[in-house]
């Protein structure tokens, strides 16, 4: 607890004060006043320094002084031999004796007493910025007239601060402009306009005048402006440093004038506005502005629209073009809306075609769309090359959106057929060389694929089993075989109307309108064993003259089987019709007269006992085409013949062509259109 | 005159490789499908491969399957059998065979001898 | 794979007696069965084909029959010519393959 006064005696005093002591006394005083420390006697053992025994007084980290020895008075009126004034309210005694002692000294006697400090004059720092004034224990600081004592109590400063300015449009200056500003002051001006508008403050170099900056370039008094995150300044000198138009991007202003102790000047003025907000003319890449304006403020809407080609993307949705607003805060509303190119996507598959993955789906990319040549070619034509448009959708010059359709080539062989006479009536044939035969099971019999969905065949071959079970793509008609062969289901068979359905077939004496159609429940996937051939024309170029050659094929009976394992073919020349009828009916099951002939068959054979015969029927008589010599199309079906290994008569399919093409599109899937 | 002469046998290390041939005379020879069969010395007949008049169809027995290749020369009227990574197992007569039609052979060649051993 | 077991493996038979060997498939062949000979030191010869037909310029005494999985080849009189070995031979897939052969000899 602190106390104005107190004494302080060495250990046994008046006695001798024993060795090897050491104690220290806290002398703490109020507040606000300083120690008056005296000794009215002193006797220690005297050394070098104080080295061996010694009085030692301390103010904080100061060593005082270290007293030993005998002191005695100078005034004979005053009983201090030794004193200490110190400004402070705390001071520590420390007396220390050493092992022994030569002679018998008895100590010290000491006193303390609490004295008034002048605080306005003791120190080196001054407490206050303008008037100091003293009383006992302490003091205060007063300030001039106009001036007012800040929190700190010490300072003095102008009442400045606390302005808030609102209008759009304004002047502000410092204290008593144009004379001198008051020292030691902060001034805090606030400017607080509506928001979307900035603050533009404006000044002239001669409304300026700050005192300088010392030597390290540090201003002494200085104006700041601060825009929320953003400063401007400090500034200080003779004419303003800084630019004379500030455009803060901020509807909010503080400005801070600091002053010190020192050097005042005229100090300074400006004015402000308030403008709308500006926002930036963003570069916003592939995109137009409307309307454009070289300059966007406050609540001004920009359209901004993609070029072709690109698009706006928000979440799932594409748009060609959004709207932006000039925020309060000098940002465009949905700034995060970008045009990018349109993406066209993966491109979609087409059935028995591809197209290459392609390195972008971007706007201006290239696809390419290929058939799996040489079993399908590209029917709409078009190229294949589709672009990525404007619109998002792949598009080709000449098909626009709509997808390339491969379809199969029709009538080519993938090895051509070399006929050898080796075998009396045909040769060994390989699947290759006809690869649109169909071979049907019960009964035993052909027919032709003319494209994915359909089978062309003989009536006669359908007419009694209208669910027949067929195989394409092997050249051998074992059961192991065509296990691996593709095997073809019927949806249904069209048998020509004109075709006369008989109770017993066997009798049967009129072969007219021998053609049916079996339509297939899945499309056939063409190759180099199953394509189709194709259909005749329907010009006179598609008119068989006599000696004009054909192709047959099938698995039917040889001279040495009843029913061939490899499929046999064999080359014939059409023959007039009449050299069918001069054939004597073998096994004829009526008068020959009733046989009917008409001009719905072709005759051919007769040629080096080279025949079709029983187990044939329905296959395709394959002649070439006029107008394209690589391919062949169907002339004739097998239909009927007097004896086999002479003349047969053949379907003539151009006669039944508009039947065929009605036929399918009246049965067509969707898929196929 | 039918004539199927056969060509190319001897004797080899197992691991090496030997080629047959077999010359055709007295018929068309790209009009027939052809075969090699084997007979092992005191055993009985293997069929090893066949091939198509073209040449574009092969089947091949299992126990040579990536080993031997089938192949024909229409224009020199001749038949091949390339034999690779021979093996004791493969120690045969080596017949080619006319297909006369569907799987019947009715010409065969008088066969060479294919010795296989260290 | 599809097993032709041909029996008996050989027989002895005297001049003029009927001669019957049989072939039984592991599986269906249909009629897709040829019987060849082959004599000492000489190439197979086509005797019959299609289970039943006879080749052309095979003597009459040859004859096949059966379907499906089991076949019989006669010789209804041998003769001293017909020694030799028989094969029976299936082509209904691949790999084609034979009998292990029947040894004709004279008594």
């Known amino acids: 607890e602190p106390t104005m006064y107190g004494e302080i005696l060495s250990p046994n005093y008046p006695q001798a004060y024993p060795s090897e002591v050491e104690k220290s006394w806290d002398i703490e005083v109020p507040e606000g006043y300083g120690i008056h420390l005296y000794f009215t006697h002193l006797d220690i053992e005297l050394s070098e320094n104080c080295a061996y025994d010694s009085v030692q007084i301390i103010s904080g980290d100061t060593e005082e002084g270290r007293l030993c020895g005998q002191r005695s008075s100078n005034n004979p009126h005053s009983p201090i031999v030794e004193e200490f004034q110190v400004p402070y309210n705390k001071l520590q005694v420390i007396f220390k004796s050493d092992f022994s002692n030569e002679e018998r000294f008895t100590g010290f006697a000491a006193y303390y007493v609490a004295t008034d400090i002048n605080e306005c004059t003791d120190f080196v720092d001054v407490p206050c910025s303008h008037f100091c004034n003293n009383f006992i224990g302490g003091y205060f600081c007063s300030c001039p007239p106009e001036y007012f004592l800040h929190d700190d109590m010490k300072n003095c400063g102008v009442n400045c601060s606390g302005d808030v300015f609102t209008a759009l449009i304004g002047e502000i200056a410092s204290p008593n402009y144009p004379k001198p500003y008051p020292e030691n002051s902060r001034c805090e001006y606030q400017i607080r306009l509506e928001k979307g508008f900035q603050v533009v403050v404006t000044l002239r170099r001669e409304d300026f005048d700050v005192e300088a900056a010392d030597s390290a370039g540090n201003c002494l008094d200085s104006l700041v402006f601060v825009a929320g995150d953003r400063q401007f300044g400090p500034y200080c000198g003779h004419g303003f440093p800084g630019p004379l138009n500030i455009e803060t991007k901020s509807n909010a202003l503080d400005i801070i004038f600091q002053t010190d102790l020192t050097g005042q000047k005229k100090g300074w003025k400006l004015r402000y506005h308030g403008d709308p907000m500006p926002c930036p003319k963003e570069d916003t890449p592939n995109s137009v502005w409307e309307p454009a304006k070289a300059k966007y403020v406050f609540r001004d809407v920009v359209q901004i629209t993609c070029l072709d080609g690109f698009e706006v993307v928000e979440g799932r949705v594409g748009a060609t073009s959004f709207y932006s607003t000039c925020q309060s805060n000098g940002k465009w509303s949905n700034s995060k809306l970008k045009c990018q190119p349109v993406d066209c996507g993966i491109p979609e598959s087409i059935e028995n075609g591809k197209v290459e993955d392609p390195e972008s789906t971007l706007f201006g990319s290239v696809i390419r769309y290929t058939c799996e040549e040489p079993y399908y070619y590209m029917e709409n034509g078009g190229g294949g090359e589709y672009h990525c448009a404007g619109n998002g959708s792949w598009v080709n010059e000449v098909l626009g959106p709509e997808l390339p359709k491969c379809v199969p080539v029709c009538g080519v062989p993938r090895e051509p057929f070399e006929e050898k006479q080796r075998i009396i009536g045909g040769s060994d044939a390989d699947i290759k060389n006809f690869p649109w035969q169909v071979f049907f099971d019960n009964p035993w019999a052909g027919g032709a694929l003319i494209n994915e969905y359909w089978v062309l065949t003989a009536a006669h071959v359908v007419e009694g089993n209208r669910e027949p079970t067929m195989y394409v793509g092997s050249t051998s008609v074992q059961t192991s075989r065509l296990a691996k062969s593709k095997m073809l289901t019927p949806e249904h068979v069209f048998i020509h109307p004109g075709w006369k359905l008989l109770e017993v077939p066997e009798g049967r004496t009129n072969f007219d309108n021998d053609i049916a159609l079996v339509r297939l429940k899945d499309p056939v996937k063409m190759g180099p064993t199953v394509s189709p051939i194709c259909l005749p024309g329907t010009s006179s170029d598609y008119n068989l003259m006599d000696g004009d050659l054909g192709l047959i094929s099938g698995w039917g009976r040889t001279e040495k089987r009843d029913r061939a394992v490899r499929l046999k073919a064999a080359r014939l020349p059409v023959a007039p019709l009449r050299k069918c009828k001069e054939v004597k009916v073998e096994k004829p099951t009526a008068d020959a007269e009733a046989y009917v002939f008409t001009p719905n068959m072709i005759c051919a054979g007769g040629e080096k006992g080279m025949d079709s015969c029983k187990g044939d029927s329905g296959g395709a008589f394959a002649v070439q085409d006029p107008n394209d010599k690589t391919k062949f199309y169907a002339a004739g079906l097998v239909s009927w013949g007097p004896q086999c290994g002479t003349y047969g008569l053949y379907t003539r399919v151009k006669n039944y062509v508009d039947w065929i093409m009605k036929t399918m599109q009246e049965n067509s899937t969707p898929r196929e259109d | 005159e039918v004539q199927l002469v056969e060509s190319g046998g001897g004797l080899v290390k197992p691991g090496g490789s030997l080629r047959l041939s077999c010359a055709a005379s007295?018929?068309?020879?790209?009009?027939?499908?052809m075969s090699w069969i084997r007979q092992a010395p005191g055993k009985g007949l293997e069929w090893v491969s066949y091939?198509?008049?073209?040449?574009?169809?092969?089947y091949y027995a299992h126990s040579v399957k990536g080993r031997f290749t089938i192949s024909r020369d229409n224009a020199k009227n001749s038949l091949y059998l390339q034999m690779n990574s021979l093996r004791a197992e493969d120690t045969a007569v080596y017949y080619c065979?006319?297909?006369?039609?569907?799987?019947?052979?009715?010409?065969w060649g008088q066969g060479t001898l294919v010795t296989v051993s260290s | 794979d599809i097993q032709m077991t041909q029996s008996p493996s050989s027989l002895s038979a005297s001049v003029g007696d009927r001669v019957t060997i049989t072939c039984q498939a592991s599986q269906d062949i249909s009629n897709y069965l040829n019987w060849y000979q082959q004599k000492p030191g000489k190439a197979p010869k086509l005797l019959i084909y299609d289970a039943s037909n006879l080749e052309t310029g095979v003597p009459s005494r040859f004859s096949g029959s059966g379907s499906g999985t089991d076949f019989t080849f006669t010789i209804s009189s041998l003769q001293p010519e017909d020694i030799a070995t028989y094969y029976c031979h299936q082509y209904e897939d691949y790999p084609l393959t034979f009998g292990g052969g029947t040894k004709v000899e004279i008594k």
């Open positions: 091939i198509s008049r073209s040449g574009s169809t092969k």
């Open positions: 065979a006319r297909d006369e039609t569907d799987y019947a052979y009715d010409e």
């Open positions: 007295g018929f068309t020879f790209s009009d027939y499908y």
